[in-house]
């Protein structure tokens, strides 16, 4: 996160860290807890690393440097990448992770509500992006979970800023015209959440951007509302019944 500040314990209890353990262990992506046994993240996090056993998912944590060999983590039972996601394109950058064992909810580890299907009418004015990613383009992973308040921008405006890309209706953009605040490398897969009527909702999944926090280059996020049918279908067919945090 560029231009952010430190988060507090329990402030973003749905935020998880997706880490890979090969010779060393490192944080690669963020993710959002959406049910006892489900994490929503970006499909591109798994490019070149599709093996379930190398991944460790840490939930209910604030500081990555607190993780030791004794820190509990979740393992992956199944990775479900959107069927239309292609490595050669930037579309449908969404994936579900089914955990091997369900997580108990606590003050520091609980799910984020999902938006309504095809939610286009809600005007979100209070949106935040969180993650342990770089604090500048040529930076490094941060120890303490960062947060930053970023306004949504219209898809029309976003398309103007990214003429060389196709901004689809299944993407949502956020950023300041002058730059300075944005997600960055290592924040991929993490949440863009917006507070509406006193409730936090998962509006976007951190996907991509041209550099980080550059002027007139907003961050681009996978629009969760556009994938509600897919999320429900995959979680229900796997569970027999949905266990998602849908909005009231």
């Amino acid at each position: 996160i560029v231009g952010g500040t430190n988060s507090s314990w329990g402030e973003w209890p749905w935020q998880v860290s997706l880490q890979v353990k090969l010779t060393a262990q490192r944080h690669l992506c963020g993710g959002s807890l959406i049910g006892h046994q489900w994490v929503l993240t970006a499909a591109h996090c798994f490019d070149g690393l599709p093996l379930q056993d190398v991944w460790r998912i840490y939930s209910g944590i604030l500081n990555l440097s607190d993780i030791t060999k004794d820190t509990p983590f979740s393992q992956i039972k199944e990775i479900i990448i959107h069927q239309n996601y292609k490595v050669s394109e930037g579309n449908h950058d969404i994936a579900l992770i089914k955990l091997q064992a369900p997580l108990n909810y606590t003050e520091f580890q609980k799910p984020i509500c999902l938006p309504s299907k095809g939610d286009t009418s809600t005007i979100y004015t209070n949106c935040w992006v969180t993650g342990w990613g770089f604090s500048k383009e040529k930076g490094e992973i941060q120890n303490i979970l960062q947060k930053v308040n970023i306004p949504l921008v219209t898809n029309e405006e976003c398309q103007k800023r990214y003429q060389d890309y196709k901004i689809t209706q299944r993407m949502v953009c956020a950023g300041y015209k002058e730059g300075g605040k944005d997600a960055c490398k290592g924040d991929s897969g993490g949440p863009l959440v917006c507070k509406h009527n006193g409730m936090w909702r998962l509006v976007g999944i951190t996907s991509w951007g041209e550099g980080c926090a550059r002027r007139e280059q907003p961050g681009v996020y996978t629009k969760v509302a556009e994938y509600m049918d897919w999320i429900l279908e995959k979680t229900q067919s796997s569970d027999g019944k949905a266990q998602m945090q849908s909005p009231a």
């Epitope: 970006a42 490019d47 490398k185 290592g186």
Partner: antibody, heavy 125, light 108 residues
């Protein structure tokens, strides 16, 4: 199956014009940035031009700027290169290619993932 | 413009040998925008490596790419008869997009 098929090459006199076409199939053409690359006989590859998915943004190599125009018709899944004021040094095989732009570590990638078979343009009197 | 300098110009090797091809750039190139292509006579180029180190679909694992910043390398661990041809590195980090002049890998 992804296919790119160039046409329109041939022999033309210096100062003449030619229009190359590239018919695309097997992928969502309107989502892809498209490019032209050329290769003079016995030489290396030279990037010529690219066009954004919507067609609203174009960039050219200095060697062709002001003489060549890239365009596309997304309804016909076709890419074009209009070449005017042709010179002997424009003699080359012209390839069209789709530019893949995936995502890696929150940044986009960029590479020419599919190429046509090429069409030969010969500029000679 | 970003200049791409490949070395050596020609590499004469026997089947089974290891080939190491270098590509140097005149300015910093984001690895995500660095690709390698193979071209055999009379054929269109074929994508081998993208993002400096990711193998394209269908490319055998004897091909690998490494590098960062201004120095990039393509390695063919054990040359097969079909690997002979010309190899190009290319950047699309900044326009004009540029190719290296190519390295020809020939049978010794």
């Amino acid at each position: 199956e992804v296919q790119l098929l160039e046409s329109g090459g041939g022999l033309v006199q210096p100062g003449g014009s030619l229009r190359l076409s590239c018919a695309a199939s097997g992928f969502t053409f309107s989502h892809y940035l498209m490019t032209w690359v050329r290769q003079a006989p016995g030489k290396g590859l030279e990037w010529v031009s690219y066009i954004s998915p919507s067609g609203g943004h174009t960039i050219y190599a200095d060697s062709v700027k002001g003489r060549f125009t890239i365009s596309r018709d997304n309804s016909k899944n076709t890419l074009y290169l209009q070449m005017n004021s042709l010179r002997a040094e424009d003699t080359a095989v012209y390839y069209c290619a789709s530019v893949a732009r995936g995502i890696a570590a929150r940044s986009r990638t960029s590479y020419f993932n599919q190429w046509g078979q090429g069409t030969l343009v010969t500029v000679s009197s | 413009d970003i200049q791409m300098t490949q070395s050596p110009g020609t590499l004469s090797l026997s089947p089974g040998e290891r080939a190491t091809l270098s590509c140097r750039t005149s300015q910093f190139v984001n690895s995500n925008y660095l690709a390698w292509y193979q071209q055999t006579p009379g054929q269109a180029p074929r994508l081998l490596i993208y993002g400096a180190s990711s193998r394209a679909t269908g490319i055998p694992d004897r091909f690998s790419g490494t590098g960062y910043g201004t120095d990039f390398t393509l390695t063919i661990s054990r040359l097969e008869p079909e690997d002979y041809g010309t190899y190009y590195c290319q950047q699309s980090s900044r326009t004009p997009w540029t190719f290296g002049q190519g390295t020809r890998v020939e049978i010794k």
